[in-house]
Interface confidence: low
């Protein structure tokens, strides 16, 4: 449906508040270094212009595309070249190349200061003094640090952020009320950002077909009673929504997501029995709820898959006539029967089925050739099952911190060229799979664990892509989206790695470690562990454990000392010498 003025159309659909919030998110995700005040000024100018177009859609420039309007506005920033360097060259291009250029310059790891949480009273005062600015600042700070954050979902986070301050700033114990809520929002926000980053990577690096396959599998697990045609429609609409958000078209994305939620709720009888509660909520909560809704019960009388996909004499005829539809039906039928499988496993099975048909449908006796295709699935299913079983046993034995350390050592030995902060961040997140998934019964472990690992390994892939240092990482990240985890699992110690020179400075600690939170202290220790492995990749578990135990004792001792700084200086030298001796450095 063509509109005379796209900007007026979106302003009317979304309303002023959401329009302004989404434009701010879009600008902050593109120009991540720009000060807050500059962005607010740009957003206000765009909003005023949108209002003139609402009043008269034929007014000057109202017929321009949103990319043209937004790109022109971003290119008015005076300090573009000094702040962003070659990104300023984007402004010499015409649409759509200019927008593509801006997208390519999005930085997954921007050089921005860590967000420090002020005292609760300070935050509450700022909230009461100017609620609107306070909430805009939240959107801005999250968006610039997470340039692929799912924009309509960020509006939902902002709504919860506002609710937390509204409630807790009136509470008797403000901190007890507010801090757990902020912690929860921070952790959920990081998880949401990482999940969306995988969706965007899937679309941008592997194409629409890969994303659609993922969506067919996931939606079929979630809505097993829905008809294939219904799932296909949802997949098409969902792909459009995520393509738009990943492409920076945030107004269209939010608008289309609202339409999709409306459609799902109007047609819930034919989609899922689990949607009733979600559909009674307001828009932002409704969309979030639908995205997280539990799997519906499987229909009771589903027939065997073999009849249509192995035993039928028409398999090759059907495959030849409409390959993607036939494979889509296979994936739909397999996924709705297997909520106990990870999406990536289902996609591996579909890929195996496709490869088999490609080979067998050209053979002399196709049916004889593909008759045993389901037997090929067995090892593919058993591999993640065994891996999860082993790692959950290890997690239960060690606890989260030591399990993270085991993964730190494992991954540093696999890809020692990767930067220490990235190895620490990724391994810590990999280690969280234990507390997140191992508590689940068998039937829920694999979808929880392997699909979570896909999200975490994508973080490694996008961070590594910015500054590639390891051919092995590049290979695992680019060869196959669904085989990333098996590819990394299969990596052994990198025998080609030349150990890092020993640098005593890396292992010098100061009294400031004593005032850190437990989490920050763990990160310091884990950073030291990665560095140790980089110096001595062939160190045994026992050697590393002995050094880390000594290190923990050293920190504890010096943090209890009267003259902490002297203790760290003197005992630190002894620790370094003892560690060098223990590891033969």
């Amino acid at each position: 449906d063509a509109h005379k003025s796209e900007v007026a159309h979106r302003f009317k659909d979304l309303g002023e508040e959401n329009f302004k919030a989404l434009v701010l998110i879009a600008f902050a995700q593109y120009l991540q270094q720009c000060p807050f005040e500059d962005h607010v000024k740009l957003v206000n100018e765009v909003t005023e212009f949108a209002k003139t177009c609402v009043a008269d859609e034929s007014a000057e420039n109202c017929d321009k595309s949103l990319h043209t309007l937004f790109g022109d506005k971003l290119c008015t920033v005076a300090t573009l070249r000094e702040t962003y360097g070659e990104m300023a060259d984007c402004c010499a291009k015409q649409e759509p190349e200019r927008n593509e250029c801006f997208l390519q310059h999005k930085d997954d790891n921007p050089n921005l200061p860590r967000l420090v949480r002020p005292e609760v009273d300070v935050m509450c005062t700022a909230f009461h003094d100017n609620e609107e600015t306070f909430l805009k600042k939240y959107l801005y700070e999250i968006a610039r640090r997470h340039p692929y954050f799912y924009a309509p979902e960020l509006l939902f986070f902002a709504k919860r952020y506002k609710a937390a301050f509204t409630e807790c700033c009136q509470a008797a114990d403000k901190a007890a009320c507010l801090l757990p809520k902020l912690d929860e929002l921070r952790d959920e926000g990081k998880a949401s950002s990482a999940k969306q980053r995988l969706k965007c990577a899937s679309l941008q690096k592997f194409g629409e077909r890969a994303f659609k396959a993922w969506a067919v599998a996931r939606l079929s697990q979630r809505f097993p009673k829905a008809e294939f045609a219904e799932v296909s429609k949802l997949v098409t609409d969902l792909t459009k929504v995520h393509t738009e958000c990943c492409h920076g078209d945030l107004l269209e994305c939010a608008d289309d997501r609202a339409d999709l939620a409306k459609y799902i709720c109007e047609n819930q009888d034919s989609i899922s029995s689990k949607l009733k509660e979600c559909c009674e909520k307001p828009l932002l909560e409704k969309s979030h709820c639908i995205a997280e809704v539990e799997n519906d019960e499987m229909p009771a009388d589903l027939p065997s898959l073999a009849a249509d996909f192995v035993e039928s004499k028409d398999v090759c005829k059907n495959y030849a006539e409409a390959k993607d539809v036939f494979l889509g039906m296979f994936l739909y039928e397999y996924a709705r029967r297997h909520p106990d499988y990870s999406v990536v496993l289902l996609l591996r099975l579909a890929k195996t089925y496709e490869t088999t048909l490609e080979k067998c449908c050209a053979a002399a006796d196709p049916h004889e050739c593909y008759a045993k295709v389901f037997d090929e699935f067995k090892p593919l299913v058993e591999e993640p099952q065994n891996l999860i079983k082993q790692n959950c046993e290890l997690f239960e034995q060690l606890g989260e911190y030591k399990f993270q350390n085991a993964l730190l050592v494992r991954y540093t030995k696999k890809v020692p060229q990767v930067s220490t902060p990235t190895l620490v961040e990724v391994s810590r997140n990999l280690g969280k799979v234990g507390s997140k998934c191992c508590k689940h019964p068998e039937a829920k472990r694999m979808p929880c664990a392997e699909d979570y690992l896909s999200v975490v390994l994508n973080q490694l892939c996008v961070l590594h892509e910015k500054t590639p240092v390891s051919d092995r990482v590049t290979k695992c990240c680019t060869e196959s989206l669904v085989n990333r985890r098996p590819c990394f699992s299969a990596l052994e110690v990198d025998e080609t790695y030349v150990p890092k020179e020993f640098n005593a400075e890396t292992f010098t600690f100061h009294a400031d470690i004593c005032t850190l939170s437990e989490k920050e202290r763990q990160i310091k220790k884990q950073t030291a562990l990665v560095e140790l492995v980089k110096h001595k990749p062939k160190a045994t578990k026992e050697q590393l454990k002995a050094v880390m135990d000594d290190f923990a004792a050293f920190v504890e001792k010096c943090c209890k000392a009267d003259d902490k700084e002297t203790c760290f200086a003197e005992e630190g030298k002894k620790l370094v010498a003892a560690s060098q001796a223990a590891l033969g450095l």
């Epitope: 009673k225 829905a226 008809e227 294939f228 045609a229 219904e230 009888d269 034919s270 989609i271 229909p299 009388d301 027939p303 249509d308 039928s312 028409d314 005829k317 059907n318 006539e321 409409a322 539809v325 036939f326 039906m329």
Partner: nanobody, 115 residues
């Protein structure tokens, strides 16, 4: 894209007959069992009848047995439902679906049985 387009609905008196058609496209029609599902105003979807891919095996809900006949023409990619001895309680929107789930994925055609 998979598409299912129903037609043939309308207003009919009790005891009358209608023949519904469903034109299918975007998938290999001849490979899949098909069903008719109906949804009466204010109620959930109800499975009516099913037919296998070749047309040999047909099934019916108790409420329509002996009155409705499902058939298909694979050369035309079309599914049919012949409805005889219609009753007021047969008033509903009728949908064709792939497979045998009591859910709907298309626009449907309205059948109203009333004197």
């Amino acid at each position: 894209e998979v598409q299912l387009l129903e037609s043939g609905g309308g207003l009919v008196q009790p005891g009358g007959s209608l023949r519904l058609s469903c034109a299918a496209s975007g998938f290999t029609f001849s490979s899949f069992g098909m069903s008719w599902v109906r949804q009466a105003p204010g109620k959930g979807p109800e499975w009516v009848s099913a037919i296998d891919s070749g047309g040999a095996d047909t099934r019916y809900a108790e409420s329509v047995k002996g009155r409705f006949t499902i058939s298909r023409d694979n050369s035309k990619n079309t599914l049919y439902l012949q409805m005889n001895s219609l009753r007021p309680e047969d008033t509903a929107v009728y949908y064709c679906t792939i497979g045998r789930s009591a859910s709907r994925g298309s626009q449907g055609t309205l059948v109203t049985v009333s004197s």
